[in-house]
């Protein structure tokens, strides 16, 4: 016996699609081997249609599509608009066709329906809108109409034009009679549910000239859509639901066993704590239809998923759905990233975002989830030089290190920075990541002077001191400007002596200004970094006024400190529970700290089940000076 | 509360047929996919037969070891279904337990797995003398 397994027999309308799901045993050689669907012919042998490397035949070019989905050990063939000419008999196998790794599958397409017997046939979606048209003859233009559904062997009144509805069609239901010029009458039911399926009888008058009418009601469960996407990517349902619900709160609900759809998100504020800081419901265009996206996917979120409408704001019977079944891909194109960054207040925090290496030159951007009304990412900074007005000098987006990966350093931290910030690109959309920002207790490692004014014509030297703990690394003084960090000569002054209990490894490195211009008015951040990875960075507003008295200036740190409103900030290198990822070039000394106030805390963004990566400063590296 | 009702098990003989209904009852209860599953003494839960449906496309599955002899329909209404079990043999003999799932789940979920069924009838004992 083959060891595949599949639906020994698919039968399906002209016009459909099927999904064929073939199991195979998940051995390391099963998951990578070739799989296959073809058509047996009549002498033997048996004609590849599609396979995972890529044929596909011109049978069905446009129409059809194979997935592997090698952690489940299956694989799915999905075929679209159905003919006829598609009945026949098909396997599904690993390997070679001629070799017995395959399973046979027999698939009937019948002819899609239509008038039977005089039986008007309607194929409606569940929770869409029917309309059945009733005929009738003249001489029964003034008699009673009404509409009979066939329940076991008797027919039972659904509604009639004296006023009768039926308790299950209450409020869904309504019967037209067309203008004196057309011999029609109609009844419409909104809001079709399952069970509204089955044989009526459109009846026009009472006695034995009446006028009557068969009709057959077919209530379709939406197919689910295949939706395939890479762990921590993102995904985005589309749903368009028609004009007709315009005005209904919509949701999207996640089925869970039994009869539940809990609910994701919808559109009267309510929102599942497992997706807090990584989902948008878009806001609806005037046709009814919207979109959601989710970031940062995990191993947790695959499932089905459906979105609909209805004043609940969650699925009911009669909501009109769309469904789409979500896998995600656990090998993942997607780089590991910590999902947590901490910084310390006044601090700052270096967050690593990765886009698609193929799509260098898109469009950077980041920006900073807002959970109100439906959820919402305003913009902060971008790649071509915008910067949000209120970030102005304490935000800059780097291209840097490249190759896949961009760099966002946000320095003078506050309470107020905590929450969730978006990666994403103009680029591919799959490719957005969430990063949460958290703001813990500790003192800022780099030391610089508060505010510093410089006087013009004269020079001006100001400080920035660097602990013991980042002697191997390079050490630097840029000018910000909203294109980024604009580097600036610096010089190294030997020792600090702003740190207690740090040895001779600390470091004093100071920024010149010589002959101090209006132009040099503005942020200077100093701070560490190891080629392109980037570290703490601390910053300091420099303003230029007239000359007061002849001589340069030599901003101490002491000034500084008695300064109330110094700007200070965090460390940004990147500590990751549980999981190492450190890069070992730029934080070699630092330690994989587990954090059991993250642990404990449920609503976290965590991209990847069972471990929590996070980014940041630990308060115990931190040293005090007084 | 969803029930399901066995229903046309019995003692039949060897090489004769056999047709077991299943009926899945319960407020607004439509179930996505209906099996038959079996279980002979001191043995495990053995997949027999399943079919699942999405529209107008119905999948079915057949457990190996009935193959060729056991087929699976629905009525039109979809709460109903059937296991017709033709030229049975005495290793036929166990309890037949219907299944049905009301939500859809993961594709890719095998049909063949007892767990990733959400309800049970309580079974119909067939008996094939020899």
């Known amino acids: 016996k083959s060891p595949i397994f599949g639906p020994e027999e698919v039968n399906s309308v002209e016009g459909n699609s099927v999904s064929i799901t073939c199991y195979y045993p998940p051995t390391s050689v099963n998951r990578h081997t070739r799989k296959y669907w073809c058509r047996q012919g009549a002498r033997g042998g048996c004609i590849t249609l599609i396979s995972s490397e890529g044929y596909v035949s011109s049978k069905y070019a446009g129409r059809a599509n194979l997935t592997n989905f090698p952690e489940n050990g299956t694989f799915v063939v999905n075929i679209a608009q159905l003919s006829q000419d598609d009945s026949g008999r098909y396997k599904c196998g690993l390997g070679i066709n001629s070799r017995g790794l395959s399973f046979d599958v027999s698939l009937e397409v019948s002819q899609g329906p239509g008038l039977l017997n005089d039986t008007k046939v309607y194929t409606v979606d569940l929770g869409r809108t029917v309309t059945i048209n009733c005929p009738f003859k003249t001489e029964n233009a003034q008699k009673r109409k009404s509409l009979y559904k066939q329940i076991g062997l008797y027919p039972v009144l659904v509604i009639d034009s004296s006023g009768y509805v039926n308790p299950n069609y209450t409020g869904r239901i309504r019967l037209d009679i067309q203008g004196t010029g057309q011999l029609l009458f109609s009844v419409v039911i909104n809001q079709l549910r399952l069970s509204d399926a089955g044989q009526y009888l459109c009846q026009a008058g009472d006695d034995s000239n009446s006028n009557k009418k068969n009709a057959d009601l077919q209530v379709l469960k939406p197919e689910p859509e295949l939706v395939y996407e890479d762990l921590r990517g993102s995904v985005t349902f589309h749903c368009a639901l028609g004009p007709e619900v315009a005005n209904v709160a919509k949701f999207l609900c996640r089925q869970s066993s039994g009869e539940n759809c809990d609910v994701v998100v919808n559109t009267l504020g309510k929102r599942a704590p497992a997706f807090e800081g990584r989902i948008l419901l878009n806001p609806q265009d005037k046709d009814g239809s919207f979109s959601v996206v989710i970031t940062g996917l995990r191993k947790e979120d695959a499932g089905r998923y459906l979105c609909g409408a209805h004043s609940d704001g969650q699925l009911q019977e009669g909501s009109p759905i769309q469904a789409w079944q979500l896998f995600v891909n656990e090998e993942s194109t997607i780089p590991r990233s910590p999902t947590v960054v901490k910084g310390v207040a006044g601090s700052s925090v270096a967050v690593l975002c990765p886009y698609n290496r193929k799509e260098s030159k898109s469009i950077k951007y980041w920006c900073l989830w807002e959970g109100a009304q439906n959820g919402r990412c305003p913009l902060l900074v971008d790649s071509e030089g915008w910067v949000k007005a209120q970030y102005e000098g304490r935000l800059s987006l780097l291209e840097e290190p490249g190759n896949g990966t961009f760099t966002v350093i946000l320095n003078q931290l506050t309470s107020r920075d905590a929450g969730f910030y978006w990666c994403l690109t103009n680029g591919d959309t799959l490719w957005r990541t969430t990063v949460e920002i958290k703001i813990i207790e500790g003192e800022p490692n780099l030391k610089v002077p508060g505010n510093v004014t410089a006087v013009l014509g004269e020079t001006l030297k100001v400080p920035c001191h660097f602990p013991c703990k980042f002697s191997s690394y390079e050490k630097y003084w840029c000018k910000w400007n909203n294109t980024g960090c604009q580097a600036l000569p610096s010089q190294d002054e030997g020792p600090s002596k702003a740190f207690v209990n740090c040895d001779e490894n600390s470091r004093l490195v100071s920024l010149t200004l010589n002959l101090v211009t209006r132009a040099d008015e503005g942020w200077y951040w100093c701070g560490v970094k190891q080629g392109h990875f980037y570290g703490e960075t601390a910053a300091v507003y420099v303003a230029v006024e007239e000359r007061k008295a002849a001589g340069s200036r030599d901003v101490s740190l002491a000034k500084a400190d008695a300064a109330p409103d110094e700007k200070v900030l965090d460390s940004g290198f990147r500590e990751i529970e549980n999981k190492a990822i450190q890069d070992p070039r730029l934080f070699a000394e630092e330690k994989a700290v587990a954090d059991t106030r993250d642990q404990a805390d449920g609503s976290r963004a965590s991209v990847d089940s069972g471990s929590s990566e996070e980014q940041g400063g630990s308060s115990r590296h931190h040293h005090h000076h007084h | 509360e969803v029930q399901l009702v066995e229903s046309g098990g019995g003692l039949v003989q060897t090489g004769g047929s056999l047709r077991l209904s299943c009926a899945a009852s319960?407020?607004?209860?439509?179930?996505?996919?209906m099996g038959w599953f079996r279980q002979a003494p001191g043995k495990e839960r053995e997949f027999v037969a399943a079919?699942?449906?999405?529209?107008?496309?119905?999948?079915?599955y057949v457990g190996g070891s009935v193959q060729g002899r056991f087929t699976i329909s629905r009525d039109a209404a979809g709460n109903t279904v059937y296991l017709q079990m033709n030229s049975v043999k005495p290793e036929d003999t166990a309890v037949y337990y219907c299944?049905?799932?009301?939500?859809?789940?993961?594709?890719?979920?095998?049909?063949?797995?007892?767990?990733?069924?959400?309800?049970w009838g309580k079974g119909t004992q067939v008996t094939v003398s020899s």
């Open positions: 299944a049905a799932d009301r939500v859809p789940k993961d594709i890719s979920i095998d049909p063949r797995n007892p767990k990733d069924w959400d309800y």
């Open positions: 319960g407020r607004t209860f439509s179930p996505y996919a």
């Open positions: 079919i699942r449906w999405s529209g107008a496309t119905t999948y079915k």
